[in-house]
């Protein structure tokens, strides 16, 4: 299709080489079409546009994204060629930063329902640059935490070193929806609830004599509880003896509950005690089996390919630890009788 009629928007993504960060492009269809199509309505319910030249489907996933190769080749379907780019409804998610993401991205509705719709498309010219010198050593992170029940704020990473007075007007989105009342480089939250968690996008306009473009940053915000004051507790094994069959394989599971910690470095391992000897056993990776706001349950198994007589004289010890302290639970194997 002819993209010369598409509206054009220029965006800049300056990424930090120090941290992992994501980026998003919204299918910013021209105002009347967008309101009907992508449900990201900038109008109040009373301000109905006079006419809707694009009568697209209300299904938010009915958008097609393309990339325009720089060598003039035909447009490429994003889904087929770029595994690190994911389409979610009207939004394109870039999972990894890098200058190779620079280029022209075009979105348009899948269903063309009227002659007007042919030109219903947006071309986004994305420039991706690594952050140069440490002009701002303490710039806000692309991952920010809000403590539930307290006051907090979400800062726009690309503007966090500027004072509110000198900061340009900022457009904020949360989970793809415009936050029309927020215009500063920082969103202040009076009391944090779990619904404040989400993906926030901050945009501001930067201009020079030639052109202007939108500088965009994405912030992943999570709502958290305060750090635990407790060491982890072992939920399983409960008993300190276990009946086993000699010569048969055996799996012993260790499940431990770790309270929430912002910097979370859980340790869960198995070691074996044999008289005065102790050694750690390399076992399969630990896996998280349940995760809530307050805690996480982690499991790690030790597998005995077969139980030997010697194993009956050994103690199998599960050791768990967080920043507060550690807990152990030992298991003695006992031969099944009869």
């Amino acid at each position: 299709f002819n993209i010369s009629g598409c509206s054009t928007k220029k965006l800049l993504w300056t990424y930090s080489t120090r941290s992992e960060e994501e980026f998003v492009l919204f299918c910013d269809l021209p105002e009347p079409q967008k309101s009907h199509f992508c449900h990201r309505n900038r109008l109040s319910p009373k301000q109905v546009p006079e006419h809707l030249p694009f009568m697209g489907s209300n299904d938010l996933s009915d958008v097609q994204w393309y990339q325009q190769p720089s060598n003039g080749d035909p447009l490429e379907d994003i889904r087929k060629s770029y595994p690190h780019i994911i389409q979610d409804k009207c939004t394109l998610h870039f999972l990894t930063p890098g200058v190779n993401n620079s280029g022209s991205y075009i979105c348009r509705p899948k269903m063309i329902k009227s002659p007007y719709d042919v030109a219903c498309c947006v071309k986004m010219i994305l420039e991706v640059k690594p952050q140069t010198n440490a002009s701002c050593e303490y710039s806000a992170s692309h991952k920010q935490d809000l403590l539930l029940g307290s006051t907090g704020s979400i800062s726009c990473p690309s503007l966090s070193c500027q004072s509110d007075a000198q900061s340009p007007a900022v457009t904020w989105y949360k989970n793809g929806k415009l936050l029309s009342v927020e215009r500063s480089n920082r969103i202040v939250v009076d009391e944090v609830y779990d619904y404040h968690q989400g993906t926030y996008v901050c945009d501001y306009t930067q201009s020079d004599t030639v052109s202007s473009w939108t500088v965009r940053a994405v912030v992943q915000v999570r709502t958290i509880v305060g750090d635990t004051k407790l060491k982890p507790d072992i939920l399983d094994p409960v008993e300190d003896t276990l009946e086993v069959e000699l010569g048969k394989p055996l799996t012993i599971s260790c499940k431990a509950r770790f309270g929430f910690e912002r910097v979370f470095n859980p340790v869960i391992k198995w070691y074996i005690k044999d008289s005065d000897l102790e050694w750690e056993v390399s076992v399969p990776e630990a896996k998280s089996i349940k995760s809530t706001l307050k805690d996480e349950i982690i499991e790690r198994n030790i597998i005995l390919e077969k139980v030997t007589q010697r194993d009956l004289r050994r103690k199998f010890v599960c050791f768990v630890q967080n920043s507060i302290g550690n807990t152990t639970q030992s298991v003695q194997l006992k031969e099944k009788r009869g």
Partner: antibody, heavy 121, light 110 residues
Framework: QEELVESGGGLVQPEGSLTLTCTAS?????????ICWVRQAPGKGLEWIAC????????TYYANWAKGRFTISKTSSTTVTLEMTSLTVADTATYFC?????????????WGPGTLVTVSS | DVVMTQTPASVSEPVGGTVTIKCQAS??????LAWYQQKPGQPPKLLMY???DLASRVPSRFSGSGSGTEFTLTISDLECADAATYYC????????????FGGGTEVVVK
């Protein structure tokens, strides 16, 4: 009397295949016993190849270098085979089968006399 | 993979003497170690398992010690019949199975 005997060795061309058989007499393979193959190149040391759990014969274990080219199988309650493919001159060795201690441990307590495999063109 | 390093490669001692063979594991293997004796033209014979347990019908002149990464086989009151090559072997059956032999030590009895 409990015994293990290997058979199937002989001369084979490079890139050829061979299947060795380990036959037990005086006992049959049970789940607590593992049957393993070990080889020894002329004038060299012992090298572990693979093991199989005697009972079901489902669980198998291989040395990293043997994965893909060597396959251990339990073919009856008294026989275990070692199938070898893509053989090279470096595979020339005496191949032993051995039974471990069963419930007493993993060490190899009973050994066959060995069968010689020569890979040569 | 676990690598077993055996020293010395060869040792010579008179009848009645004592021989000490060392085996080092590249990682902590607890006490999951066996020792074998092999004479020319014969299969290996199990001497010790679990580092220090004597196999059946093995004379008490043979003893094993050590744990973790350092292991020792000691043969005291050396006899002519002890002339052979001795191998250590790691046999480890926790969350997978690992087996590896040392390079061997030739014992010559003078």
């Amino acid at each position: 009397q409990e015994e293990l005997v290997e058979s199937g060795g002989g001369l084979v061309q490079p890139e050829g295949s061979l299947t060795l058989t380990c036959t037990a007499s005086g006992f049959s393979f049970s789940s607590s016993y593992w049957i393993c193959w070990v080889r020894q190149a002329p004038g060299k040391g012992l090298e572990w190849i693979a093991c199989i759990v005697g009972g079901g014969g489902v669980n198998t274990y291989y040395a990293n270098w043997a994965k893909g080219r060597f396959t251990i199988s339990k073919t009856s309650s008294t026989t275990v085979t070692l199938e070898m493919t893509s053989l090279t001159v470096a595979d020339t060795a005496t191949y032993f089968c051995a039974r471990d201690l069963g419930a007493d441990g993993y060490a190899y307590h009973l050994w066959g006399p060995g069968t010689l495999v020569t890979v040569s063109s | 993979d676990v690598v077993m390093t055996q020293t010395p490669a060869s040792v010579s001692e008179p009848v009645g003497g004592t021989v000490t063979i060392k085996c080092q594991a590249s990682q902590n293997i607890g006490n999951n170690l066996a020792w074998y004796q092999q004479k020319p033209g014969q299969p290996p014979k199990l001497l010790m398992y679990d580092a220090s347990d004597l196999a059946s019908r093995v004379p008490s002149r043979f003893s094993g010690s050590g744990s973790g990464t350092e292991f020792t086989l000691t043969i005291s009151d050396l006899e002519c019949a002890d002339a052979a090559t001795y191998y250590c072997q790691c046999t480890y059956g926790y969350s997978g199975y690992v087996s590896a032999f040392g390079g061997g030590t030739e014992v010559v009895v003078k």
